[in-house]
């Protein structure tokens, strides 16, 4: 299980009216459920139940976003509509370029994501926990537009990838 280096760039409007970017680095793990490769896109917070819904399945999708899913305690959802892997698969089917799971409340999900799948997704499925998950969710919950870049090697300089 390789380390996933995640850079999160937040777009903030400055008093002068320009957009300023703030970069935060955190680490997670690439799971065996997906590919170990780089991905980048706007962060889209997805509720676990939001991935249950079937009524978007005939849609044309928008691509290139990074789904962030905070998993709940298993007791709160004893009969989930989909497995964690199923949720990752659905997000990718809907156009996600990567999926990041916050597994802090549901550490058993790590094993589910790392069961050697015969048919892993072609996009990265990353999990974060602890301080890194808190950092990520604090940004996601800010109600700001943010972009994530996932890498499988440490970024050399935060500014290198976001030439804003």
């Amino acid at each position: 299980k390789e380390t996933a280096f995640v850079e999160v760039v937040l777009f903030e409007s400055s008093p002068s009216g320009d957009y300023t970017t703030y970069t935060t680095g955190l680490t997670g793990r690439f799971s065996r459920a997906g590919a170990t490769l780089s991905a980048e896109g706007e962060i889209v917070q997805m509720h676990p139940l939001g991935l249950c819904n079937n009524n978007d399945e005939e849609d044309l999708y928008e691509y290139g976003w990074v789904g962030v899913v905070k998993l709940e305690q298993p007791e709160l959802d004893p009969k989930p509509c989909l497995t964690v892997l199923g949720k990752a698969k659905r997000a990718v089917q809907r156009g996600a370029t990567a999926v990041i799971f916050d597994v802090s409340e549901n550490p058993e999900a790590i094993d589910q994501l790392n069961q050697g799948s015969e048919d892993p997704l072609k996009r990265p499925v990353v999990y974060v926990k602890g301080a890194d998950a808190i950092k990520l969710m604090n940004i996601v919950n800010k109600q700001k537009v943010a972009r994530a870049r996932i890498q499988h090697r440490p970024p050399r300089q935060p500014t290198e990838y976001f030439d804003m």
Partner: antibody, heavy 116, light 107 residues
Framework: EVQLVESGGGLVQPGESLKLSCSAS????????MHWIRQVPGKGLDWVAY???????LYADAVKGRFTISRDNAKNTLYLELNSLKSEDTAIYHC??????????WGQGTLVTVSS | DIQVTQSPSSLLASLGERVTITCQTG??????LNWYQQRPGQAPLLLIY???SLQTGVPSRFSGQYSGRSFTLTITSLEPEDIANYFC?????????FGAGTKLELR
């Protein structure tokens, strides 16, 4: 079937306000980001504003501080509040679904005319 | 703001001809550029996203390429229904910006 229907356009005087709506159906509205794009008839496209599914917003320089994008997920509706309107805001305003870009689904638009 | 320069502003072409439209950006935007088609009286239609990816349902005669800050939309063999206006959009850095458009007409 995905549908986006704009309303609320009309004729207003410079300095006045207007609130546009975009009613969405055929998809889980709360899962998606939404954009407003405007077009002076016969001219080019102008990106106006974006709201993410979690409520974060971005604006074009020309409208920042005057226009406000918002959404009501319970009503499956996107809004654009236009204040301190200027004659150069005259355009057809389209809503479109998408995250960092307006995707394959656009509404037909509602015409805003600012004139004295 | 990132400047997007689209050329040509208008273009005369014959049916079956190969057509190329270019957008140049003022700074690097990776591949964050889309192409849209707009026929008279209609809403724009997404053709290409992330510079090279063909939107589902769009004919394969449309393609996108890029090199550095230069992006091209190519129609390999012009069909009557391709007569329209074409716009590019950079969505790398807000505020997002469209090119001024290219009006494609039949010769």
């Amino acid at each position: 079937e995905v549908q986006l229907v704009e309303s609320g356009g009309g004729l207003v005087q410079p300095g006045e306000s207007l609130k546009l709506s975009c009613s969405a159906s055929g998809f889980t509205f709360s899962n998606y980001g939404m954009h407003w794009i405007r077009q002076v008839p016969g001219k080019g496209l102008d990106w106006v504003a974006y709201i993410s599914n979690s409520g974060g917003s971005l604006y074009a320089d020309a409208v920042k501080g005057r226009f406000t994008i918002s959404r009501d997920n319970a009503k499956n509706t996107l809004y654009l509040e236009l204040n301190s309107l200027k004659s150069e805001d005259t355009a057809i305003y389209h809503c479109a679904r998408g995250y960092s870009y307006p995707g394959p689904y656009w509404g037909q638009g509602t015409l805003v005319t600012v004139s004295s | 703001d990132i400047q997007v320069t689209q050329s040509p502003s208008s273009l005369l072409a014959s049916l079956g001809e190969r057509v190329t439209i270019t957008c140049q950006t003022g700074q690097s935007i990776n591949n964050y550029l889309n192409w849209y088609q707009q026929r008279p009286g209609q809403a724009p239609l997404l053709l290409i996203y992330f510079a090279t990816s063909l939107q589902t349902g769009v004919p394969s005669r449309f393609s996108g390429q890029y090199s550095g800050r230069s992006f091209t939309l190519t129609i390999t063999s012009l069909e009557p229904e391709d007569i329209a206006n074409y716009f590019c959009l950079q969505h790398y850095s807000p505020p997002y910006t469209f090119g001024a458009g290219t009006k494609l007409e039949l010769r």
